[in-house]
Interface confidence: low
């Protein structure tokens, strides 16, 4: 059980406050992280608080302001770089968001030896993508879908490619479909170690279909804004890895790195690039089926210019119980002797959990193994191997940091912060300094976060980097709702859940209950995290019980929980649900006629097949910016999960988990349904074809749009949406406003 | 689709002024973004100033603060007011219109074009 800081004195209950929805929708409970920017084994900048950016030597214990918020404030920046010889700092302005990840912006180069601006041979605007080499200060950069290289700030740029085109083709970044759901980068360009070559993608969208949508804007007639967007079973990108020599560009050219034969037969994808040496690569590709990955390690060829790719160093990862990987295939982190590497895929028993592989797969030798997963591998140094796993105590939605040392035969295991402070923090991530001589450990709950500094040799703490004090005297006087995180065993399935108390709260009496819910494949909503967000209000103003579920198909808990929805999407993850709810019932504080569901996206598609399963359970719901068929969800994604939507395949699946074919199912719930104009991942047309469908099967539902807003319904959208939804389950739950 | 046609060039003095306009025919001309293109003899046509379907503009640093550039939807016509002309400027101004983002400045990124109209600036 966890308690979240309430205060339950008689004498000090007058003095405390429930949780309003203004506090929510203006962000007044929300927690600082500090991530240092690592420069050197012993040096990270910082932005301080009144925007000077600022060096910290962690052994000697000096700072100084290395440029100045004036500097800063000159050219309206938000965003900084500085280049590895720390001669020059790039200067990010005029921000403009494209999708998840990707945005455009102006750069300006700063020499730090002058204590001026780079005139001649500026940079053009807006720029898609810019970074420094990772030794001196060479630039790439991507304008316009072309690639361009500088070997100083100051000097022309060497253009890469020429066959960049707006929606056609890509040069060192990813199209939609690969942004969104593979890479999970705005950028598609490598540099080798010591900056010698430059790797990089090459999306050809020619053929691609593409999604249109209006965008209504303020004009005459509304803008229509084209993406190629993949949707299952249709026609893909086409991808090429190129690498070219950045000392003397011009000399070969770009060469392209051969596929391997076995991914090269039919349909694929390129996954990662994984830089190993100046000299040495390792790239991964997926089969467009998805459950077989190859990774290939490729030598620089000297006396031909060119990149080799042996067969004896390609490695499969396939499963034969779902697709590979767990959201996205892992990557390698290479050891010492640049051709071993430790990898995170499923043992014997199912369970993720890192491997050392020397020569072949076949032969891995498993690092760590148990009835948990290895989640992340942070750093390996010639020592140790630093992870986190949600191994201890057996709570799936916990994250610890371990270290094993590999130096020494038999490695041995620690963990770095289980004991540390271990009611506050059960869920950690970590970053770390060059060779490992110093890291950071950014606690996220489930008390308030907290970010300290560590010797990276004794574990010791060094000092406390952010303890969100402000926000801990904020919450004094605040009646925080109750958290608990419990598991149920059913038919030999775990479902794990979190359940959000009324601070006064009591078993005797019945509660409205709220279910929130996911549920997508490889996600995992059930963490001892730190949150005051709007089903925190939920609990504590309106007196709800609110719980979160993680069914089938949800991540850490082995490959049976993970794949068990492979090729069934809609089907368990609904079932788990209803089944949490009706153990909850028995539990006796919840009130059976006053029961609601409501999700976002996946969850969106999850709470609108829950609502539409014909039990009687849900009183009301809300799906929001939901899939209503996975023929209109991309390709990568949706494929990975469901294969094709072709007759020979799994059309009929496809045909059978809509939300359009229950609409019948919705005529004895209220329904609201809410989506974005301009949603560019979940289309409207999801939505579009539910409310069809309900017309059409003359079933009365409430629906709200939000004009040229995309998946996210931020800004004023945002205040909207909370309280729209608020007042649907108020009413729904007969509470007085 | 839009077809484009320049007016307004010519002959002028070392800081005198001029005002280029383009017009356009085709019924969706609101939807696109227009640019003024510059081709000075022997050089590649380079961007000038450009203008969104929004109303957003965009100019070259060379031209900041003495061009404007601005459309009339109604009129289906867009504007290219040039001040304190210097003898640089001189070449042919084309109209250009791009469905998208009128950031682009390579003019192989952008899809109609009209015939172009002389500016002469003499000292």
């Known amino acids: 059980i966890v308690l979240r800081p309430s205060r339950v004195h008689n004498s000090e209950e007058n003095t405390m406050r429930a949780l309003t929805l203004k506090d929510i929708l203006n962000g007044t409970f929300s927690y600082k992280t500090f991530f240092p920017n690592w420069i050197s084994g012993q040096e990270y900048l910082h932005q301080s608080a009144d925007n000077n950016i600022v060096l910290y030597n962690i052994e000697t214990g000096q700072s100084y302001t290395i440029l100045s918020n004036r500097t800063m404030k000159s050219v309206n920046a938000s965003n900084y770089g500085l280049s590895p010889d720390r001669q020059f700092v790039y200067l990010e302005s005029d921000y403009s968001k494209l999708w998840r990840y990707s945005y455009t912006a102006t750069y300006y180069i700063y020499d730090l030896s002058n204590g001026e601006f780079v005139r001649g041979n500026e940079l053009p605007r807006p720029i898609q993508y810019l970074c420094w080499s990772p030794v001196g200060s060479k630039l790439a950069y991507v304008y316009q879908n072309n690639i361009y290289l500088k070997q100083r700030p100051g000097d022309p740029p060497f253009q890469i490619t020429f066959n960049g085109r707006e929606n056609k083709i890509f040069n060192g970044i990813p199209d939609w479909v690969y942004e969104e759901e593979m890479l999970a980068t705005k950028y598609a360009l490598w540099w080798s170690p010591n900056g010698k070559f430059l790797a990089y993608a090459e999306f050809n969208d020619t053929d691609i279909p593409v999604i249109a949508y209006s965008y209504y804007g303020d004009e005459q007639y509304p803008r229509t804004i084209n993406i190629p967007y993949p949707k299952a079973g249709a026609k893909n990108p086409v991808v090429r890895i190129f690498i070219i020599d950045t000392t003397y560009p011009a000399y070969v050219g770009p060469q392209e790195v051969p596929v391997p034969a076995m991914i090269a037969s039919s349909d694929y994808y390129f996954s990662w690039l994984t830089w190993v040496t100046d000299e040495r690569v390792c790239l991964q590709w997926l089969k467009r089926v998805q459950n077989v990955s190859v990774l290939s390690i490729c030598d620089f060829r000297e006396d031909w210019q060119t990149w080799d790719c042996p067969k004896t160093q390609e490695h499969i990862e396939e499963s034969r119980t779902g697709w590979a990987g767990g959201f996205f295939v892992s990557t390698p982190v290479f050891s010492y002797d640049a051709i071993s590497y430790y990898k995170i895929f499923s043992d014997k028993d199912g369970y993720k959990h890192i491997h050392y592989i020397k020569d072949t797969v076949e032969n891995a030798i498993q690092i760590t193994s148990g009835k948990w997963e290895a989640i992340n591998i942070f750093r390996v140094t010639q020592d140790s191997l630093f992870y986190s796993s949600n191994e201890f105590e057996e709570y799936p939605g916990r994250r610890n940091i371990y270290r094993i040392s590999i130096g020494s035969y038999p490695p041995s295991k620690k963990c770095v912060t289980c004991h540390l402070r271990k009611e506050r923090c059960q869920y950690y991530t970590a970053s770390f300094s060059d060779y490992a001589k110093y890291y950071a450990l950014v606690c996220y709950g489930p008390g308030i976060p907290i970010s300290t500094l560590h010797d990276g040799r004794t574990d010791q703490e060094i000092k406390i980097l952010e303890e969100n004090k402000e926000l801990e005297n904020a919450l004094k006087n605040i009646q925080l709702p109750k958290e608990e995180i419990k598991k149920l065993e059913v038919d030999e399935i775990t479902l794990w859940y979190k359940m959000i108390l009324p601070p006064q709260f009591d078993r005797s009496k019945k509660y409205p209950l709220l279910i929130q819910v996911y549920g997508g494949p490889c996600s995992q909503s059930v963490r001892s995290v730190f949150a005051v967000n709007w089903i925190s209000y939920l609990a504590s103003k309106e007196g709800m019980v609110i719980a979160l579920v993680d069914g089938r198909g949800t991540a850490f808990q082995g490959d049976k929980l993970l794949y068990a929805v492979y090729r069934k999407l809609g089907v368990y993850e609904v079932e788990d649900q209803i089944t949490a709810v009706r153990k909850f019932i028995e539990m006796g504080f919840i009130d059976e006629k006053r029961i609601a569901i409501w999700g976002w996206s996946y969850g969106g598609y999850v709470s609108s097949l829950a609502l539409a399963s014909g039990t009687g359970l849900f009183k009301c719901g809300i799906a929001v910016a939901p899939v209503s068929s996975w023929e209109y969800y991309a390709s990568v994604y949706t494929e990975r999960f469901m294969g094709l939507p072709t007759k020979d395949d799994n059309l009929e699946h496809y045909k059978n988990s809509t939300v359009m074919a229950r609409a019948e199912y919705f005529r004895n719930v209220d329904y609201l349904l809410i989506h974005g104009t301009a949603d560019d991942n979940v289309h409207f047309q999801n939505s579009a074809q539910i409310a069809k469908a309900l017309v059409n099967a003359q079933v009365d539902f409430q629906a709200m749009w939000y004009s040229d807003q995309n998946h996210g319904l931020s800004g004023l959208s945002t205040n909207h949406l909370y309280t729209h939804m608020t007042h649907f389950l108020k009413q729904c739950f007969s509470l007085s406003d | 689709q839009v077809q484009l046609q320049e007016s307004g060039g010519g002959l002028v003095q070392a800081g005198g002024s001029l005002r280029l306009s383009c017009a356009a025919s085709?019924?969706?001309?609101?939807?696109?973004?227009i640019g003024w293109f510059r081709q000075a003899p022997g050089k590649e046509r380079e961007l000038v100033a450009s203008i969104s379907s929004g109303g957003s503009t965009n100019y070259a640093d060379s031209v900041k603060g003495r061009f404007t550039i601005s459309r009339d939807n109604a009129e289906k016509t867009v504007y290219l007011q040039m001040m304190s002309l210097e003898p640089e400027a001189t070449g042919v101004y084309y109209c250009?219109?791009?469905?998208?983002?009128?950031?682009?400045?390579?003019?192989?990124?952008?899809?109609?074009w009209g015939q172009g109209t002389q500016v002469t600036v003499s000292s």
């Open positions: 085709g019924r969706t001309f609101s939807m696109y973004a």
């Open positions: 250009a219109a791009r469905d998208g983002s009128a950031l682009y400045t390579a003019h192989s990124d952008w899809d109609y």
